[in-house]
Each structure stands twice: as C-alpha cells, then as structure tokens.
C-alpha cells in the first residue's frame, strides 16, 4: 500500500476517507488504528458498530469518529479539533475474525500555519498511468504491514 497523506490545520476538523471494494469487504467491520513506533503494532483508535448493518452510525472515541458507507465502499474517519500530537501514521482496516486487512495507510500531517489552510483535508490518489499528480507530502510508504517494516513518520 502507498500512503495517502491528509493535511489538516490545528484546531480544525480533518476528514479521512478510505475507499474499498464493497463486495470484497462485505459484512466486515472496519477500524482506524495508529501505528506505534517504527515497527510497533497498529493500536486501535475506533471501530465501526458491532452490528455491521449499523456501520453507517457514527461512533466516537474521544475526538475521533468513524462511519462506514458499506454500499458505496467508503470508510470515513473524522479527527475533530486536530492537534499536533495527532500527526502520524494510521491505517484503515477491514476486520475479519482475528485478522485485519489494510484498506489504506494514512499519514496525517498537522499544519500549524493558518495561512496554509488551503491544504487542509486534501487527498490525492496517484494514478495508474505513467504520469500522476504528486502527493506533495514528505514521503510515502509502500511496504505492507506483514513485513513489519513500517517506519514511524518524522515529527519534525
């Protein structure tokens, strides 16, 4: 998985979307987790409703909310009142049994400069073609969780 970067401004809300194949992930609950350390586990922040049919209901854990459009195939996470400590590497996951499939790796960047608010919440999907719009972030990460090599994003 490449990492998609979402930039938000401190104090504002940031919405992260994770598209997925609605058929492939039919009847699966979803989760949002934070990567801990360079090679650490992905710690669950919030997950969708225990009853998959109610996944559209927004669930909160502190300032983080999750909701799932199971028909359209889009998981949406909202980070309210974004703070610098929210910056980091996250994952959208699809849960099945004790396993979790990574739907998307997300790097959340928090901009302190209000003059740069135009960047807030934007996301970019590098295309499949030879030429694609650049993500305009400090880095992207392509190795999968299974390899245990996901680096912790820089805090500088």
């Amino acid at each position: 998985h490449n990492t998609t970067v979402f930039q938000g401004v401190a104090g504002q809300s940031l919405q992260v979307s994770c598209p997925y194949d609605s058929m492939k992930h039919w009847a699966r609950r979803k989760a949002w987790c934070r990567q801990l350390g360079e090679k650490g586990p992905c710690q669950r922040v919030v997950s969708t409703h225990n009853l998959w049919l109610l996944s559209f209901l927004r669930r909160w854990n502190g300032s983080t909310a999750i909701t799932d459009d199971t028909l359209g195939g889009t998981l949406t996470i909202t980070l309210r009142n974004l703070q610098p400590h929210d910056a980091g590497l996250y994952q959208c996951q699809s849960l099945h049994g004790s396993e979790a499939d990574t739907l998307r790796k997300v790097l959340v960047e928090v901009l302190a400069d209000p003059l740069d608010h135009r960047d807030a919440g934007d996301l970019w999907f590098p295309g499949e073609s030879e030429s694609f719009e650049d993500a305009h972030v400090e880095h992207s990460i392509s190795r999968s969780l299974l390899e245990g090599e996901i680096p912790f994003p820089p805090t500088s």
Epitope: N2, Q7, E109, L111, A112, D113, L115, D116, R118, D119, D122, W124, P126, E130, S131, F132, E133, D134, H136, V137, E138, H139, S140, I141, S142, R143, E149, I150, P151, P153, P154, S156
Partner: antibody, heavy 123, light 112 residues
Framework: QVQLQQSGPELVKPGASLKISCKAS????????MNWVKQRPGKGLEWIGR????????NYNGEFRVRATLTADTSSTTAYMQLSSLTSEDSAVYFC????????????????WGQGASVTVSS | DVVMTQTPLSLPVSLGDQASISCRSS???????????LHWYLQKPGQSPKLLIY???NRFSGVPDRFSGSGSGTDFTLKISRVEADDLGVYFC?????????FGGGTKLEIK
Amino acid sequence: QVQLQQSGPELVKPGASLKISCKASGYAFSSSWMNWVKQRPGKGLEWIGRIYPGDGDTNYNGEFRVRATLTADTSSTTAYMQLSSLTSEDSAVYFCARLLRNQPGESYAMDYWGQGASVTVSS
Amino acid sequence: DVVMTQTPLSLPVSLGDQASISCRSSQSLVHSNGYTYLHWYLQKPGQSPKLLIYKVSNRFSGVPDRFSGSGSGTDFTLKISRVEADDLGVYFCSQSTRVPYTFGGGTKLEIK
C-alpha cells in the same frame, strides 16, 4: 548545514553497470525524498526518479525505470543510483538533489544539490 | 508527461538591464490542493543547479529580491530587475505538480 557529497568521475565500458553514491549530511536524511537528475553535456535536466530513504519507496521516470535502481542506506545517510547496460547515451553528469521539506508555505522543489558525478561511457 | 517549454533559448542582456524568461507547460500546473508547483533554478558554468524560486513566486533563502516569479496555470515568467554579472548562467523552470518531474530546456543569460 545541508551537504550532498557525490562520488567521483567514472569511465565505464558500454554494457557495464555503475553505482553512484550521494552522501547526505546536515538534515534528517530518512525523512526527505532524494531525487536523481541527469544532465548530458550542453543539454538540459532530466529527472530520473526519487527515493524516500526512510522506507525505500521509489518513483521513476518511465524511460529510466528499466535500467536505473535507486537505493538508500540510512545508517550511512547515503543514497545510491545504479545504472545498468550503459551506452554512450548515458554519458552525463548525474546529480542527487534533496526535495525541500514540506513545511507550510514551502514545498516541493529541489533545494540542495550534489556537485554532480560525471560518467563517461566509452570503449 | 508534462512538457516544459522555455523561451528564449538565449538571452543577451546588458548589466543593469531587466531580463525576462518565459516558461510554458503543456498542461496546467495547478495541483488539486490549489498550489502551483512551478520552480526556477539557475545553473552557473561548472556548477550544480541552485534553487531560486519555488511555487511560482517564492524566493528561496538567500536569493536577492531582484529575482521575481509570476504566472499561473500554464504560463510563467521569471524576471531579473537589474542583471548583475553574477546572474549569468542557464535558467531552468521545473514542475513538480505531476510525477515525473520535468524541466524546461533552459535559457542562457549572457552579456550582450
């Protein structure tokens, strides 16, 4: 201060391979993209590709994808570019260049460049 | 790929004069985030390129205010208000809105 020190000039035979190094210092090497740029004598600049040393992620310019391999060693803060099956068309100066860190209002140009590594392909 | 076209190829100027270099891209350089990633570099003889202007009009640190960049979409201009001997060299525009990054062919600024 930021410095990018590249390896010396090389004379190689057609068909051979070559590895150029770029030793970085003065900044967080792991968390900045490193670009490689080709300049043939009297010609313009061609972007070869880039690597993110923190995890080895790469993007290549299509025409270089087959013969160029970008790697990085974070322990020595050194980036490498290997070129294979060299021809006279590969005779050029190769630059490494750091991508300006993505700070608010300041992003995505190559702000520091190595001095260039001259490569001559000749039998 | 985005094709960058610079004009003129060569620009003879007298010291103290104003110089203007044009750069045109084959497609819009406006990123989906609203910014335009068009940059200008100067390469002096025997040296590596140096960043002058980033994102159309922002001077990089240490670059004199004689240098200014402008433009939008696909048409961009670098102006040097009072050319000094130290300004001579080849100027390149470059885009990093889309991968692969691409450069213009260069404009050689020389003494008339």
